[in-house]
Amino acid sequence: GITNINCSGHIWVEPATIFKMGMNISIYCQAAIKNCQPRKLHFYKNGIKERFQITRINKTTARLWYKNFLEPHASMYCTAECPKHFQETLICGKDISSGYPPDIPDEVTCVIYEYSGNMTCTWNAGKLTYIDTKYVVHVKSLETEEEQQYLTSSYINISTDSLQGGKKYLVWVQAANALGMEESKQLQIHLDDIVIPSAAVISRAETINATVPKTIIYWDSQTTIEKVSCEMRYKATTNQTWNVKEFDTNFTYVQQSEFYLEPNIKYVFQVRCQETGKRYWQPWSSPFFHKTPETVPQVTSKAFQHDTWNSGLTVASISTGHLTSDNRGD
């Protein structure tokens, strides 16, 4: 960067090289060039020469003043006009940054995705800081009082093998950057309560020829958890409102769910599960599309192994029976 150049003087920033966005700042340039009494001192920001708000302080020093500086990053350097020198002489350069202190991290959440071997902790970091911000995740055993700390820039995956202090823990997050530090509230967790079952996947849909055509959705999960509650949400693709159907599920076999749908309409549906009675749900599965036939012939939609969202060929279907509707999003 600009800070690696050989200097013939000194450049510095007040109040600091990293400062709060929107502040007034001063950049000072002091020349120390052999056989040069600078006639002028020039400032450059990102390669563009600055024209305004430059004040000469003394024979060797000038100040550039910025009001309400809003750029997250800028490369500054300054030069001198020396008598008898045809070109400007480089004095020094510095990278400057502006941003915000971190907000208090909130919505701290820790989950264990089944088979992952990790506890994944996430949080809402708040507003963008624009500058390098680090997070320290503290995990303290409520049984042994032992505390472990994990440094990260975003979320963290903690191996469950490293959680040797029993089942109950306190988790909190500390956010810090050059402008400040904040700490979240403590989250109390029990490892058995935060497991999210292996992803539920919709594999295919078929509409069966009958007096009243019926669509069957086939779906499954590799979970070994015995008591699993699931939700399937579905709607016509032209609708805004989802319908939601709830299931208590045993994944020892592929699930089949029946829906009575309007003919000749494209439907979308998704599924998600949780360990019965626990707090955390899986994210909704990839959208699965199914267009019902105009009349009686059987139509089957199969899920491919790759991401169904982009294929547009895999489909899910929805019942128009006596079901409650729900505006739940993701």
């Epitope: 009494q37 600078p38 006639r39 002028k40 563009i48 020469k49 600055e50 024209r51 305004f52 430059i54 004040t55 000469r56 003394n58 024979k59 006009e81 008598p83």
Partner: antibody, heavy 119, light 107 residues
């Protein structure tokens, strides 16, 4: 040889507009700052507006007395400097000179164009 | 903005006289000073820049000196064509500013 030729001056009523032009030749127009300097009858020289060179990203400056009324611009493809003067006042009556600066002193000047604001 | 004060505002001199015009800045301008000559109905003409550098084509009877806040334009031997108004300009800090002018008249 550097040449600067101003045009567009004349007599205009208060509140009206006028646009001055300055055709430049004999130097690398892009690399130089261009200014309008005026001189009221029997008075001294005053910098009215300045548009800087490419290295300054063509930053502009206006004297407080003309801010929000005058607009300086340049067409580098035509080697021409402009001054759009709106809401003219009697005190804007002056000879307007186009001037070139590479450093910050004015190296070359045009012959000037007279602007008279009178009802 | 930096203020420039020229003195005298006018002077009368004869051909062959040594003439000195001074310009004082409201703060140190580090030799960033230019001198201009203007004849009636004509555009200003650059004589001196960087306080003491003579612009090409300008007769050597014109010279400039000074540092800090005080600067001088000297005409060593006044010629008939030198009767004009002279202006100083500081270009140390933006925007550049002119002195109010010194009129050199025939005695």
């Amino acid at each position: 040889q550097v040449q600067l030729v101003e045009s567009g001056g004349g007599v205009v009523q208060p509140g009206r507009s006028l646009r001055l032009s300055c055709a430049a030749s004999g130097f690398d127009f892009n690399s130089y700052g261009m200014s309008w300097v005026r001189q009221a009858p029997g008075k001294g020289l005053d910098l009215v507006a300045d548009i800087n060179s490419k290295s300054y990203n063509y930053a502009t400056y206006y004297a407080d007395s003309v801010k929000d009324r005058f607009t300086i611009s340049r067409d580098n493809s035509k080697n021409t400097l402009y001054l759009q003067m709106n809401s003219l006042r009697a005190e804007d009556t002056a000879v307007y000179y186009c001037a070139v600066h590479h450093s910050d002193y004015f190296e070359y000047w045009g012959q000037g164009t007279l602007v008279t604001v009178s009802s | 903005d930096i203020q420039m004060t020229q003195s005298p505002s006018s002077l009368s001199a004869s051909v062959g006289d040594r003439v000195t015009i001074t310009c004082r800045a409201s703060q140190d301008i580090y030799t960033n000073l230019a001198w201009y000559q203007q004849k009636p109905g004509k555009a200003p003409k650059l004589l001196i820049y960087h306080a003491s550098s003579l612009q090409s084509g300008v007769p050597s009877r014109f010279s400039g000196s000074g540092s800090g806040t005080d600067y001088t334009l000297t005409i060593s031997s006044l010629q008939p064509e030198d009767f004009a108004t002279y202006y100083c300009l500081q270009d140390s800090e933006y925007p550049p500013t002119f002195g109010q002018g010194t009129k050199v008249e025939i005695k």
